[in-house]
Structure formats: structure tokens, C-alpha cells
Amino acid sequence: EVEKTACPSGKKAREIDESLIFYKKWELEACVDAALLATQMDRVNAIPFTYEQLDVLKHKLDELYPQGYPESVIQHLGYLFLKMSPEDIRKWNVTSLETLKALLEVNKGHEMSPQVATLIDRFVKGRGQLDKDTLDTLTAFYPGYLCSLSPEELSSVPPSSIWAVRPQDLDTCDPRQLDVLYPKARLAFQNMNGSEYFVKIQSFLGGAPTEDLKALSQQNVSMDLATFMKLRTDAVLPLTVAEVQKLLGPHVEGLKAEERHRPVRDWILRQRQDDLDTLGLGLQGGIPNGYLVLDLSMQEALS
């Protein structure tokens, strides 16, 4: 912490400008009025202050606003944002998307820091839900953002926001997240025609139940193997060989290369070998002809 010292004669800052870069830390502390700094925060970013000098400026703002900075100051923090701790940010009330964008811009190209995560959390909580514009902004800066949210947090995402989601935004989502996102996507995209609908819904299918996969198999969608491999195992297991063949279309040949991996491996074990043979792919491991297939899930449901 900088010691309180009197400002030397003639050094009192009248405005925030380049001359301040020549001030020592103690001179900045003594000669820059915190209220002046707050009203001219937009100038700070254009001045090449050292990290030590930025520490002093932050200290002055902290003293002026012990309960947290107002949004008028936050919006113009620029690189001073990098000096903020998550504890500082928790005191803020950020409501403007422009403020959020301005601060995300400062961190652009870097991993999501604890500061940014806290900022986003404060912003989303302040808005009450993850609306489309916010989601648009966040996924533009952090494509993996959506998949960093818990299923509980995703539950507050309105279906209209799903339009902002690109396939790459879902790359790291797990089945529990897709569980929540898939029904929202169905609501959002249902008025599109068949082929357009499939293009949009494809990335979300890791949350689809068996019945929807059966329905898709009747629509000549030609699902690629990468999408098929991301489907829920429990949703794939009840599909018949004919249904998988229709679902994958020309991509069905790819099953051979994936026969040792889930969900293909587990699905093969549930099919009659005779049925698998009709694909002509040499898939092995099905139930031999003449064996009785017991549906244990049905037995459990009855007991």
C-alpha cells in the first residue's frame, strides 16, 4: 500500500493524460484525485501505464468505491480489469451487455480466467436468465462456454437462445448437459423443414431419447458416424438393425470401424447376428441364431 504523502507543487493532475506516465507511484497516489480518475476512466486505456502504476489507480478507485464500482466506471476499466480479483468483481452490479463485451475484449484470446468467470456469473445472475444476446456474446468469446455450465444452470436458458448456438459450442458438452439442451433445441427448431431441422438439431442429439431416434430414422437424414457415436448408449440400444441402417443411410458402412467402441459395441451385443449379417459389413458379436432374447428392462419394470 502506498504511503500518504502531499502532492508536490504544480503536480496536481487536472486531467488524466500522458504526462502521468512520468509520475512515480507515490506521486500518482498523492496527485490524482479519485473522482477525476473515475470520470475519465475511458482515457486510462490509451495511456501506457506500467502495472505498478495501474495498481495505484486501482487502489484509488477501491478507496472511492469500497462497496464496488459503479457501471459507468466498470465499462471503461479496460486493462485495469486484469488487476481485479474475483472478490472485487463480486461487488459489482453489471447489467449492460456493452460493459460485458468491453471487459471480455480485454481478455480476448486467453483462457477464461477466474475474473471473467465471476464477471459472467454476476452478469447472468443479474439478468435472471441466459438470454440470446448474452449467449451470442459469450459463445463468440468462449466457444466452450455453454458446456462449462452445469445442467442446473442450463435449465434457465430459454429455448429462443438456442438459435445462437453453433455446433462447435457443444463439442465439450456431456450427456447430462445435452439432456437439458436437447428439448430446448427441439422447441426452438421444430418449425423448420426436415433437412434444415436435422442440420440444426444434429449437434444436440446426444440428449435425444430412443423414440426420437426412431422417428429420425424414418426421415432419410443420413446421420454421420461422428454424431452417431455421441448418442446416448441407452437411447441407441433399443434401435433395430433396420432402424440404424435407415438412420445412417450411406454412412452405415462406418459402423465396422467403430464396432469396438461405445455405443456401437454395446448395440451390436443386443442385435441378432442374422440381422447384423444383412448389413454385409462383417459385424461380429451379435446374439447367435436360435438364442432367446430376454428384455431384462421390461422384466425390471414389471417386478
Epitope: R176, V180, P183, R186, L187, E211, A215, R232
Partner: nanobody
């Protein structure tokens, strides 16, 4: 077209358990993607309480998680909410919600009309 109707006591004493049932008519709830509960305290916004998904996974609002249980009885076409150790802060209009259309070409979200639950001694 599904119709949802919440039922349960309108008045609950502090520290007791709030129990609500949502009865669905006009279709089978087996065709739903999820069954959930949402509430709106007087003068405040909507607050998601929790949902059970078709996959069997259950998700609860973290701030309520230790007190909430949601269950589904597809044979009765009902799902229910239990919220334990209630306080005056749990006074709200409670809505049940579901989204049907599993295996169908269209899907829709349906809400009950809501039931006011007051927590008071």
C-alpha cells in the same frame, strides 16, 4: 393438448414439508422430455425449482437442492414436488411444467395454471 393441474394445501406451517401434485390430462406423460416445477414469489421473477428428465436424470436448483424431491408416477399420469423445512421465503405461486412430443414431429411446453402456497403459522 395436455392440461396440467397443481393440487395441494394452500397453507403450510414453517418447518413443515410442502407437498404438491401435478395431474396431467389429455395425453400420457410418458411422452414427455421432462417434468418440472417453477415458482414465483410475490413481486418477484420466476425461479426454477427442478426437473426430472426422460433419461432419468434429476436436476435441482442448487439453492434448494438439500430440501427438494421431485418424483414421477407415469401410471397415474402425475408428478410431484416435496419441499422440506419451509419458511416464509417459500411463499409463492407454484407451477408444474412439462414438454411432450417424444417420438413425435412436434413438441410443446405446457404449464399448469399455478397454485398459491403460503407459509405461515
Amino acid at each position: 393438448q395436455l392440461q396440467l393441474q397443481e393440487s395441494g394445501p394452500g397453507l403450510v406451517k414453517p418447518s413443515e414439508t410442502l407437498s404438491l401434485t401435478c395431474t396431467v390430462s389429455g395425453g400420457s406423460i410418458s411422452n414427455s422430455y421432462y417434468w418440472g416445477w417453477i415458482r414465483q414469489p410475490p413481486g418477484k421473477g420466476l425461479e426454477w425449482i427442478g426437473s426430472i428428465y426422460h433419461s432419468g436424470n434429476t436436476y435441482y436448483n442448487p439453492s434448494l437442492k438439500s430440501r427438494v424431491t421431485i418424483s414421477v408416477d407415469t401410471s397415474k399420469n402425475q408428478f410431484s414436488l416435496k419441499l422440506s423445512s419451509v419458511t416464509a421465503a417459500d411463499t409463492a405461486v407454484y407451477y408444474c411444467v412439462t414438454q411432450d412430443g417424444v417420438g413425435a414431429t412436434t413438441t410443446e411446453e405446457y404449464w399448469g395454471q399455478g397454485t398459491l402456497v403460503t407459509v405461515s403459522s
